[in-house]
């Protein structure tokens, strides 16, 4: 049993790291393969992390970490039984994945102007909760062509667009991510998607 | 938020014996040592000894060893530490802490007073 | 054993003025990992100690920036670059490395 690639990390910079790997041949990760990973400078023994599978040859492991900081680095051992397969670390600070925002909502009520809102994904005791900006993506259900990104760059969890910026009459979706500069991350998955039907009135031409 | 709550004042004969609740909530119970620590008054911090809630495995310091019993219940997330034979310099107050960066998490400590 | 060795055991201070405070071990706190395990508390009047350096030089968490670590092997050092008021009561240097022992603490009071 060997290790064809090698297990690389993520952290959502709050409670939860994901690493993935690949084994040279199928493998039962959970009943053959234990991750093991410890602060460290935490002179104790390791925590235990049971990886599921991911593809026939792939695994995946959720390490639970009750918090994180920038100083912050882990030892990461790849056990079968008694025989070590791989020993690495993991600074989760240079490896952020952040959390998804949530309640994405599409407000349309307000004058032909539509206001989305969504959460952040961090409380506010996380240092990622004043560094998040956003990249909001809207598209239309009927025309693959009609697709288009608004960065946020400021912290507010909003965005205000003009209704006329879009075809009225026909339903839109609209979805959001996140990235943090601070850390350099990767993006986070796209949140849900939310949809709504898009209309307003056509201003009055004169002649 | 990490959160170490212990249990109240004792009032122990000497010769008798104390035991001292400290139940955590917050974190991993079993993914960090507790160290218990003792402060006489108006003195220093004198560590006693750790135990591990995930395995119970114990390290008592010198001091304080054939005296000492510390021991968790997972279930409740609570570790406990007993002093026996009490004597009037056991008098301090008793501090469990968790340690991760450092000691990073402390109870709010239990006075032990030691009086015929 | 190691031997922590606080020094001075009392510190007036001026708030807005700077303050330090050393700590000397009998043996090296450099572990073979390249972190020095030297801790610092401060415990104010009827409170549970509080951590505010781990590791030499990391801040913990929500502890301000006016603090912080410095030295390497036996000697540290704590600096508070601005004392305020809140900054009083006793700090304690302690060593991680082998099994706790704790400095004898200095007391900082406002002059």
């Known amino acids: 049993m060997k290790v064809l690639q090698e297990p690389t990390c993520v952290s959502d910079y709050m409670s939860i790291s994901t690493c993935e790997w690949k084994m040279n041949g199928p493998t039962n990760c959970s009943t053959e393969l234990r991750l093991l990973y410890q602060l460290v400078f935490l002179l104790s023994e390791a925590h235990t992390c049971i990886p599921e599978n991911n593809g026939g040859a792939g695994c995946v492991c959720h390490l639970l970490m009750d918090d994180v900081v920038s100083a912050d680095n882990y030892t990461l051992d790849l056990w079968a039984g008694q025989q070590l397969l791989w020993k690495g670390s993991f600074k989760p600070s240079e490896h952020v994945k952040p959390r998804a925002p949530g309640n994405l909502t599409v407000h349309t009520n307000v004058s032909d102007t539509l206001l989305l809102t969504w959460s952040n994904p961090y409380p506010p005791d996380n240092y990622l909760y004043n560094h998040l900006t956003y990249a909001v993506n809207i598209w239309s259900e009927n025309d693959p062509a009609d697709f288009r990104i608004y960065n946020v760059t400021y912290l507010e969890p909003s965005l205000r667009i003009a209704a006329s910026t879009l075809k009225s009459g026909i339903s839109y979706r609209a979805r959001v991510r996140a990235w943090a500069q601070c850390y350099n991350t990767t993006w986070s998955e796209w949140s849900p998607s939310t949809k709504w039907h898009n209309s307003y009135r056509e201003p009055f031409e004169q002649h | 938020q990490v959160q170490l709550v212990q249990s109240g004042a004792e009032v122990k004969k000497p010769g008798a014996s104390v035991k001292v609740s400290c139940k955590a909530s917050?974190?991993?119970?079993?993914?960090?040592?507790i160290y218990w620590v003792r402060q006489a008054p108006g003195q220093g911090l004198e560590w006693m000894g750790w135990?591990?809630?995930?395995?119970?495995?114990?390290n008592y310091a010198q001091k304080f060893q054939g005296r000492v019993t510390m021991t968790r219940d997972t279930s409740i997330s609570t570790v406990y530490m007993e002093l026996s034979r009490l004597r009037s310099d056991d008098a301090a107050v008793y501090y469990c802490?968790?340690?991760?960066?450092?000691?990073?998490?402390w109870g709010q400590g239990t006075t032990v007073t030691v009086s015929s | 054993d190691i031997m922590m060795t606080q020094s001075p055991l009392s510190l007036p201070v001026t708030p807005g003025e700077p303050a330090s405070i050393s700590c000397r071990s009998s043996?090296?706190?450099?572990?073979?990992?390249?972190?020095?395990?030297l801790d610092w508390y401060l415990q104010k009047p009827g409170q549970s100690p509080q951590l505010l350096i781990y590791?030499?030089?990391n801040r913990a968490s929500g502890v301000p920036d006016r603090f912080s670590g410095s030295g390497s092997g036996t000697d540290f050092t704590l600096k508070i670059s601005r004392v305020e008021a809140e900054d009083v009561g006793v700090y304690y240097c302690?060593?991680?490395?082998?099994?706790?022992?704790f400095g004898g603490g200095t007391k900082v009071e406002i002059k």
């Open positions: 043996q090296s706190l450099l572990h073979s990992n390249g972190y020095n395990y």
């Open positions: 302690m060593q991680g490395l082998q099994t706790l022992t």
């Open positions: 135990i591990n809630p995930n395995s119970g495995g114990t």
């Open positions: 590791l030499g030089s």
């Open positions: 802490a968790k340690r991760k960066r450092g000691l990073d998490g």
């Open positions: 917050g974190y991993t119970f079993t993914g960090y040592y």
